[in-house]
Interface confidence: medium
């Protein structure tokens, strides 16, 4: 088992609906029984090890498990000795123990189940930004900006959505933020604006709420 | 409990062919490679041929390149060994096994005769 | 391809015996090696896998151990269900090759 070596983290935490990438270098002897390509997967602990999909692997002729569909792949080439992980749209039910698996046919190599992978997901603890430049004026459009800079790019991207008493909004969106373009209105000023983000992949919505503070430009009369 | 059952062997002449085959239960056969190893009368073990679990990989001795094919069914959850231009050499008992990993074989079938003689 | 040579060729012993063989291989085969045990008119049986790894089911008074190109396989206290022919085998390359045996008989 000298030969066979697993460098990755023990332990990795990522927050639910985010991404991680896991580093993992994978080695092995090179053993001339085995004359195919050498193929990597990723198996969750207790899993039979023939019964079983894996969660993500190389091998494009394998099936993976349908909860893991798309959102675990296997990043590194196995046969350059990557073995690094990359998990996106984390959910809380990943938590658990992983394990590398080495595959060249017509046999089954080596599992590394000494060098396991504890996965923790925990929850969405972050809550997205609302930015207001400069000051809101009663009767002039302003751009509002929520967004989740947090948030990875690979992820599904997220819902955005915009809740307020106020008057009816034009609101346009890219990956990570979406713009709420209104004309505040004098009896706008202290209602309560909110932001829901929700991230499809893991089934979790964060929000931010903001009140609304509305000036009058000099000459306007107060009603 | 895994069983492995050999069928298809008997009396052939030189130069005549046969198909083995190896009926298996009990575990998930697609998942496994598959081995043929023969033992002439009183001699040792020879591996003869080895097929992945998914069909798609092969290999064979020396001795039997050429002549004889490794397949499986995994519908039926069926090994087979084509065996043509069967020479007296290649009597023997021939054994199918499964390999649970690494070459080595953990579970094998009772063996099927296979004579070859004029 | 890699010859495996197995000696003794056959050992008598008794009951309660301590008996050990060994099996070479022509080249390094680092732990990539099997002990089986085969009775008259059966098939093998796994004992040992992976030089030192003992098979379910078998029982602890068979171990083995070695790498590279020299094995060796113990039965601590000879059994008289151990009376049998013992093969080696290779799997680190093609083609899988087996020792010659070592029959292990009654004293």
């Known amino acids: 088992d000298l030969e066979f070596q697993l460098v990755a983290p023990e332990s990795v935490t990522v927050e639910e609906g985010l991404c991680v990438h896991v580093p993992c270098s994978v080695f092995y002897p090179s053993i001339k029984l085995t004359l195919g390509p050498v193929t990597g997967s990723w198996l969750r602990k207790g899993v039979s090890l023939h019964e079983d999909s894996p969660v993500a692997t190389s091998d494009p002729r394998q099936l993976v498990q349908k909860a893991t569909q798309g959102r675990f792949q296997l990043l590194g080439d196995p046969q350059k000795h990557d073995c690094s992980l990359f998990i996106r749209d984390a959910q809380k039910n990943d938590t658990g123990m992983y394990f590398f698996r080495v595959v060249r046919e017509p046999f089954v190599r080596y599992s590394y189940k000494k060098s396991q992978l504890s996965l923790h997901v925990t929850s969405l603890s972050r809550t997205p930004d609302i930015i207001i430049p400069g000051t809101l004026e009663a009767g002039y459009p302003s751009n509002l900006t929520c967004s989740v800079p947090w948030a990875c790019e690979q992820g599904t991207p997220p819902t955005f959505s915009w809740m307020s008493t106020a008057l009816t909004s034009l609101s346009s969106r890219t990956t990570d933020s979406s713009v709420l373009t209104f004309t505040p209105q004098p009896q706008d000023h202290g209602t309560k604006l909110t932001c829901l983000v929700t991230f499809s992949g893991a089934g979790v919505t964060v929000e931010r709420t903001i009140q609304l503070n509305v000036t009058r430009k000099s000459g306007q009369m107060r009603e | 409990e895994v069983q492995l059952l050999e069928s298809g062997g008997g009396l052939v002449q030189p130069g005549g062919s046969l198909r083995l085959s190896c009926a298996a239960s009990?575990?998930?056969?697609?998942?496994?490679?598959m081995s043929w190893v023969r033992q002439a009368p009183g001699k040792g073990l020879e591996w003869v041929s080895v097929i992945s679990g998914s069909g798609g990989s092969t290999y064979y001795a020396d001795s039997v390149k050429g002549r004889f094919t490794i397949s499986r069914d995994n519908s039926k959850n069926t090994l087979y060994l084509q065996m043509n231009s069967l020479r007296a050499e290649d009597t023997a008992v021939y054994y199918c096994?499964?390999?649970?990993?690494?070459?080595?074989?953990?579970?094998w079938g009772q063996g099927t005769l296979v004579t070859v003689s004029s | 391809d890699i010859q495996m040579t197995q000696s003794p060729s056959s050992v008598s012993a008794s009951v309660g015996d301590r008996v050990t063989i060994t099996c070479r291989a022509s080249q390094g085969i680092s732990s990539w090696l099997a002990w089986y045990q085969q009775k008259p008119g059966k098939a093998p049986k796994l004992l040992i896998y992976a030089a030192s790894s003992l098979q379910s089911g078998v029982p602890s008074r068979f171990s083995g151990s070695g790498s590279g190109t020299d094995f060796t396989l113990t039965i601590s206290s000879l059994q008289p269900e151990d009376f049998a022919t013992y093969y080696c085998q290779q799997a680190f390359d093609f083609p899988i090759t087996f020792g010659g045996g070592t029959k292990v008989e009654i004293k």
């Open positions: 096994a499964k390999s649970p990993s690494d070459g080595y074989f953990d579970y």
């Open positions: 009990g575990f998930t056969f697609s998942s496994y490679a």
